[in-house]
Interface confidence: medium
């Protein structure tokens, strides 16, 4: 028998992170989001739920809503009305799929400072929104849009097609809102709330996926929803605008789909108001490597909206697929005819184009041996957007900005040199006009918002700088992490490594992989996080490390599309090559080596354990995919075509987790699915555990009862880190 | 197969009322835009009507507006053509036809067609 | 609206030879959204081309559609004694506002 090791920080005026600080989130940080209502006004929610106006300009500031008045009503949540008069109260919220919840909504007015009764809103409501203008409201019910001209006034029914499970309108079923919106809404507002635009997803052809939920009753219940699965029967889509002015006059109008779009199966991916009469739709092949830009126009002769051949903008992969995880959208221009957009340029990186006419004639606005990330902004002078060009590490973001109305465009790094150390990774929040903007910074510091001037990009506030976390880290032991790439052939891969405090080189510790790597994602990222991994290190004296592999995002198409149509072979391969070249790093304890992912990580970190190399003696898969025939069609398809005889079947059976159920006979592994996994069904831990069984190998596995993909509720957390903890310190031989 | 069967055509005096059904099969119906084209003795083709997969949009040709309604009926697979105030010039062979996608687009099938005479 | 001008009127060939018909718009036509139709006596139209250039389905590839814009022509290389028949162009570039041209007729010389 090994003898049990115990790892001692040393030094003794700090102490080493606890598991306990970790379930209970004592090291948490806050970042500060303007919640902008014009160029230089914003609310902001206090940290006693008081909901605050901001003018920037004046440097007023006073309590619009109070709260006792959110308290009254037990609310979470609010939206001002376009015209001030009045807020929307969300309370009772009940989480349903990623995105998607529903509430009770109860509308304020400001004027009389009293709840506005009479046609109160029914419950509970699946979506609900003020018009950009005025105070509209539009929300769905029953999977149905209603519509109020004014929040005291009677609904109008929009649709009346809605049935659940059956047909959704204004909002997405679950493929759609997992894999393509990411939202729980598919409804949108012209920007003078004259159209109103919804989508209406039938899904009454398509297979349910249907699982029990234990509750606390006598008989379990049911639970059935309508999921597409690689090469199954998909949602049907239509769009529709309706004129909100006179809903009953003219009822809801189609918009067409594209020719080569809709001449096989197809989907509807994003939708962009460019002006009040023109609408940007974009749809996507099923075969996901075609996408069209449609640009449409209401036609008051015939009340119908027209989207003319000669505004149809295709995008095409010849690669892999279309855009990055999702088709880029577009950043239209003043004139709302030509727009900015992200896609790979001819050397395979995602850069910003501009496009004129035609997708042929556009004119690349960035370029480089790195990416684009997002366009933030496009006013009348600038355009601002993010990338990981700075320095050349793909796991920065930056913000810059490009002045379009200079020729030829100049451009400035608005973050680069701000707080270089502390600050490298980087979102924002532009005012309407990106008059203000407010910069949140992630790290890999701790983590700080900053309000500025969108002229002269000058620091105008700090608005959360997180000065009591930094306070209670005082004391605290944390590990040292270090971003670097290594070099394999003619690949490289970045990683990032979590070293324990008073690391030694000349020591030899144990390593956890924590893997992800699934297509378009990023792990190895210059982020603050005080997390499980960073309590292994911190008291457990593991070495953490994270690699990029191929398949990650930000670092070309080359690298990005090595996966299409061969999924669970790179990726898996990248990781075996990184560990093997930690261990030449000399400092590795080559016998205590395990790996660790949950979701796509699980399925990467079940086949490493598989791979027979004999590198990993335990490791742990959380809610794993074990195979791309089980999850969403939207998905699989997209990085492994179908699963037929004449796609790409026979790779769908050769990536499965089942296929090398022998090769766990080596390896301590264990398995963990949550039973009411809407997303990577429990069906993919049970199809495991069952080749395990078949092919006599032993394993450890956990479920957790009537828990999601997340196993988020406290208690299920709790046990779950607890036992993944006694897990490793077994396999790594470390005392309790 | 795609099909499309015409009925209801007949003769019908000026200022009465008709409707057409046409009954289609063979394809997801509620998935289309359907249109009427009628067809004058003698004469060329001409759009009368359109409606979208759902029903929910209609058009019509100037020549017909406000005497014509186009409906449909999914569950039945049925289109529809009601016409009122019939003229003269409404004499034709009224076809039904398909489009492409769910959208406007060309018409890929066409029904045999009915005959409506208008004529006292 | 958009007005379609098809000529000739009719078109006097024997089988074997090569006919072309042209159909020109008031206005351009929205990228070449046009269609065209086959129609013989007593029977429905049938449709050729679409796309002003792409074949439907089992049309034989001695019909060919081109042109962009207001110009566009349909050509069969080698007329067959089943191809007598009248022809129309349809533009659906302002769909559902659908337009067709008055016809061309070919028949046997």
């Known amino acids: 028998l090994r003898p049990s090791r115990v790892y001692k920080p040393e030094g003794n005026t700090k102490r080493a992170l606890t598991l306990k600080d970790i379930l209970n989130g004592t090291f948490s940080y806050k970042t500060y989001f303007p919640n902008w209502i014009s160029e230089q006004e914003y609310l902001h929610q206090s940290e006693d739920d008081n909901i605050v106006f901001y003018n920037i300009e004046t440097r007023e500031s006073y309590i619009i809503l109070s709260n006792s008045t959110m308290k009254s009503v037990n609310a979470t949540d609010y939206g001002l009305s376009p015209d001030r008069q009045f807020v929307y109260l969300e309370s009772d919220y009940s989480k349903l799929w990623r995105y998607s919840y529903t509430a009770t909504y109860y509308i304020y007015d400001l004027q009389n400072g009293e709840f506005v009764r009479g046609y109160e809103l029914p419950r509970p409501i699946q979506y609900l929104c003020w018009s950009p203008v005025g105070s509209k409201l539009a929300y769905v019910y029953q999977n149905n849009i209603y519509l109020k001209q004014r929040p005291g006034d009677p609904p109008f029914q929009i649709t009346y097609t809605g049935r659940e499970n059956r047909i959704f309108n204004g909002i997405p079923d679950w493929v759609y809102e997992e894999e393509m919106l990411a939202t729980k809404y598919a409804l949108w507002w012209s920007p003078d709330g004259k159209f109103l635009a919804y989508v209406e997803f039938n899904d009454s052809d398509i297979p349910i996926i249907a699982y029990s939920y234990y509750g606390d009753g006598q008989y379990p219940r049911t639970i059935n929803i309508p999921y597409p699965k690689a090469g199954a029967k998909n949602p049907v889509v239509r769009v529709f605008i309706v004129d909100t002015t006179y809903p009953h006059h003219v009822g809801p109008m189609e918009v067409p789909v594209p020719e080569m779009i809709a001449s096989s199966d197809y989907y509807f991916s994003w939708l962009t108001w460019v002006s009040s009469e023109r609408v940007c739709l974009q749809w996507l092949k099923r075969v996901q490597n075609v996408s069209v830009l449609s640009i449409c126009d209401f036609r008051e002769d015939w009340h119908a909206w027209e989207c003319p051949k000669n505004q149809e903008h295709v995008e095409e992969s010849r690669t892999g697929w279309a855009g990055g995880f999702f088709v880029s959208t577009p950043a239209f221009s003043q004139d709302a005819t030509s727009y900015y957009k992200i896609f790979s340029d001819k050397d395979g990186y995602k850069h910003i184009h501009y496009i004129k006419d035609t997708v042929e004639n556009a004119i690349q606005i960035t370029s480089g041996k790195w990416e684009a990330i997002y366009i933030f902004r496009v006013t009348q002078d600038s355009l601002f957007y993010s990338s990981n060009e700075f320095e050349g590490y793909p796991g920065r973001r930056n913000i810059y900005r490009i002045s379009i109305g200079n020729s030829p465009p100049s451009k400035k790094c608005v973050t680069c040199h701000l707080r270089k150390e502390r600050c490298q990774y980087y979102t924002a929040s532009f005012s309407y006009k990106a008059k203000y903007y407010a910069l949140v910074c992630y790290g890999p510091g701790l983590p700080i918002s900053t309000l500025h001037d969108g002229r002269t990009d000058q620091e105008i506030q700090v608005l959360e700088e997180n000065k009591e976390l930094e306070n209670s880290l005082r004391n605290i032991q944390l590990p040292k992490v270090e971003i670097k790439k290594l070099k394999d052939g003619g690949l490289t891969f970045w990683y990032k490594m979590i070293l324990p405090p008073q690391f030694d080189r000349s020591k030899k510790y144990p390593l956890l992989i924590q893997v992800y790597g699934g297509p378009c994602s990023q792990s190895v990222k210059s982020v603050f996080a005080v997390n499980w991994i960073t309590y292994l290190a911190s008291k457990e004296g593991i070495v953490i490390a994270l690699v990029d592999g191929r398949g990650t995002a930000f670092q070309g198409d080359k690298f990005l599309h090595a996966v299409y149509r061969k999924l669970g072979v790179y990726e898996v391969e990248d990781q075996l090559t990184a560990v093997r070249k930690f261990i030449e790093m000399g400092f590795i304890d080559e016998e205590r080596i395990a790996i660790w992912g949950w979701s796509y990580g699980g399925y990467v970190s079940s086949l490493a354990l598989a791979s027979g190399t004999g590198l990993f003696k335990c490791g742990i898969a959380v809610a794993p995919v074990s195979s791309w025939e089980y999850y969403a069609s939207i998905y699989s398809e997209r990085f492994m075509g179908l699963p037929t005889k004449d796609d790409n079947l026979e790779h769908y059976k050769n990536s499965t987790v089942m296929a090398r159920a022998e090769y766990f006979r080596n390896v301590d592994y264990l398995l963990i699915h949550g039973t009411a996994d809407d997303n990577v069904h429990f069906q993919n831990s049970a199809q495991i555990a069952k080749a395990l069984v078949n092919a006599q190998v032993d394993f450890q596995a956990m479920w957790y009862s009537d828990q999601n993909h997340g196993i988020s509720s406290g208690r299920s957390q709790n046990h779950l880190y607890t036992h993944m903890t006694h897990f490793l310190k077994q396999c790594f031989s470390l005392s309790d | 197969e795609v099909q499309l069967l015409e009925s209801g055509g007949g003769l019908v005096q000026p200022g009465g009322s008709l409707r057409l059904s046409c009954a289609a099969s063979g394809f997801t119906f509620s998935s289309y835009a359907m249109s009427w084209v009628r067809q004058a003795p003698g004469k060329g083709l001409e759009w009368v009507s359109a409606?979208?997969?759902?029903?929910?949009?209609?058009y019509y040709a100037d020549s017909v507006k406000g005497r014509f309604t186009i409906s449909r009926d999914n569950s039945k697979n049925t289109l529809y053509l009601q016409m009122n105030s019939l003229r003269a010039e409404d004499t034709a062979v009224y076809y039904c036809a398909k489009t492409h996608s769910t959208s406007w687009y060309y018409f890929d099938y066409w029904g045999r067609g009915t005959l409506v005479t208008v004529s006292s | 609206e958009i007005v379609l001008t098809q000529s000739p009127g009719t078109l006097s060939l024997s089988p074997g030879e090569r006919a072309t018909l042209s159909c020109r718009a008031s206005?351009?036509?929205?990228?070449?959204?046009l269609a065209w139709y086959q129609q013989k006596p007593g029977q429905a139209p049938r449709l050729l081309i679409y796309g002003a250039s792409s074949r439907a389905t089992g049309i034989p590839d001695r019909f060919s559609g081109s042109g962009s814009g207001t110009d566009f022509t349909l050509t069969i290389s080698r007329l067959e004694p089943e191809d007598f028949a009248v022809y129309y162009c349809q533009q659906y570039g302002s769909s559902p506002r659908y337009t067709f041209g008055q016809g061309t007729k070919v028949d046997i010389k």
């Open positions: 409606i979208s997969g759902s029903g929910g949009s209609t």
């Open positions: 206005q351009s036509v929205s990228s070449s959204y």
